[in-house]
Amino acid sequence: NQDLPVIKCVLINHKNNDSSVGKSSSYPMVSESPEDLGCALRPQSAGTVYEAATVEVDVSASITLQVLVDTPGNISCLWVFKHSSLNCQPHFDVQNRGVVSMVILKMTETQAGEYLLFIQSEATNYTILFTVSIRNTLLFTLRRPYFRKMENQDALVCISESVPEPIVEWVLCDSQGESCKEESPAVVKKEEKVLHELFGTDIRCCARNELGRECTRLFTIDLNQTPQTTLPQLFLKVGEPLWIRCKAVHVNHGFGLTWELENKALEEGSYFEMSTYSTNRTMIRILFAFVSSVARNDTGYYTCSSSKHPSQSALVTIVEKGFINATNSSEDYEIDQYEEFCFSVRFKAYPQIRCTWTFSRKSFPCEQKGLDDGYSVSKFCNHKHQPGEYIFHAENGDAQFTKMFTLNIRRKPQVLAEASASQASCSSDGYPLPSWTWKKCSDKSPNCTEDIPEGVWNRKANRKVFGQWVSSSTLNMSEAMKGFLVKCCAYNSLGTSCETILLNSPGPFPFIQDSIS
């Protein structure tokens, strides 16, 4: 077809000088020479579709996909990736070819896929398809440990399918509540994969390698404890193993334990019992319910009953896919300069989330605490009273969640002033956002009380510190004002701050900085 444009598709690899995330054009990169991706017309496709060779990219590498179009006149374009439209700004090179680029910074799995470029020229419309994949490489992982029963023994094996092979340890505690915190003297750690002593109050297995530490608690119903106000709930994904331990203590051995799922006794082979005498000669019995690989029909109320204790239940919910439940509406807060304050997000999630708090492109560690109602909470207090936008981000592989917070710090304005040949400008942060007045200082008004009603332009702008607003006011200079002193004042409910400027001077002339509280 004569009308078809001459198209060249190229890949430009960049050597990153840094590995911070960002999509700005000023990203510090050194480029290698372009590699031709040989854009070929795709046969038997509806419309004109060019297909570039598949691009394989290392994780964290940065690349540019570029199309050079030899076609007369202007072109317009649109990138589409995973059903989202992305901005497209064509430009022309020295040979007057249209150039369209897509920069991918710090390649991740989420950026892999098909990139479609739609180009419209005066002569014709056509589509260019790029497929970007991650170069296959091995993965270091840290997976949450799970339990298996040891063959022919009443013991649990703790397994974490991780690389490098993790150090596995059991964390045991025989007291209640707070005293079972990690570094408490009541906590005993055993660096081994198999655990025979399964009668403890709190049993966890932890796996650690250079990626961190992951723990799994043995879900337990204790018939000697008062039941929680809300029914304990256990989430699992299809295919994961289920382990629930029922524990009861009685003055003698004359009692038994049974498990039921939705009022039906568990099948033979899905439970096992152990018993022992404690130091004070009371009998401890434990009964495990287990399913090596859960299916949807394993969902329901698991009830542990005893002939000598009130029965207790737990709700086991089997999900196909993990989730994060929380309200994602943005929240705005205003606080005083010395007021104590923490951001807080309450959520329910399975599997457990990884999270970060971000402010001004800096990430902070995120701690989460489990609540009694099955929810978790993450708090962030380390804002150091810096106003701006704070972002909570959580993910667990199946789901992602982001919540925005804005923090405003109530304070009196502080004015910065500057002057050019044609105008004077003042800016101020402060909160609430200040209003402005301009006054002229003259022989008639040595205290600068004469209002300047005209030529003033006010605006608010977002400063680099994300989410922090700055108000500015500009005075356009008339010939009549040159050589005069003027005063700009910013005021809000907490006070006023002023700056005095000599008009027609190259810089600020703040020989007086008034502060009227």
Partner: antibody, heavy 129, light 107 residues
Amino acid sequence: QVQLVESGGGVVQPGRSLRLSCAASGFTFSSYGMHWVRQAPGKGLEWVAVISYEGSNEFYAESVKGRFTISRDNSKNTLYLQMNSLRAEDTAVYYCARGGEITMVRGVIGYYYYGMDVWGQGTTVTVSS
Amino acid sequence: DIQMTQSPSSLSASVGDRVTITCRASQSISSYLNWYQQKPGKAPKLLIYAASSLQSGVPSRFSGSGSGTEFTLTISSLQPEDFATYYCLQHNSYPLTFGGGTKVEIK
């Protein structure tokens, strides 16, 4: 550019202590696992220790366990190796090296395996009476 | 601990020769193996990661192969700048362990 610079080496008597530092620049230090590796004069490389990206997990070679402590200060982009009860056999050039970058991959915390890809120039520790 | 046995411990070769160095692990380490090059007075340099992946910026004459317990580093055509000591490192389990090294000298 990406750089690691070790410091703190020197001559020390057996039984004494020394602290090595490794200053990182040009990359997001707090996202990477970090290692110490040493090399005795005329000998091969010996891995010493690794610390996780957030600093809560450490692993050591048997030869240094209980005597050496690896730590990091992410706010200062610095890795440390505290060496106590030093012995003559600890005499070596000590290198710090960058490990993997933490990420979430298919729901699992992990990193793509690229080995120890960036090394410092080394700092010399001599243990002698 | 996993032992890494490297062979030969040294070899003499000429420019243009094909050179093969092997590394044997005492138990399976999947493909979690790196190859490093070290020149006197310098820090080691990563050549191959994950047993067979070439590190960015490393000449294509270097290649790695193997998985499980047997691994090989091959230099297809030895260049003057390749005379150095080469080490393998297993990163499958703690403690991490290096091979004893192979010194490649000029014949």
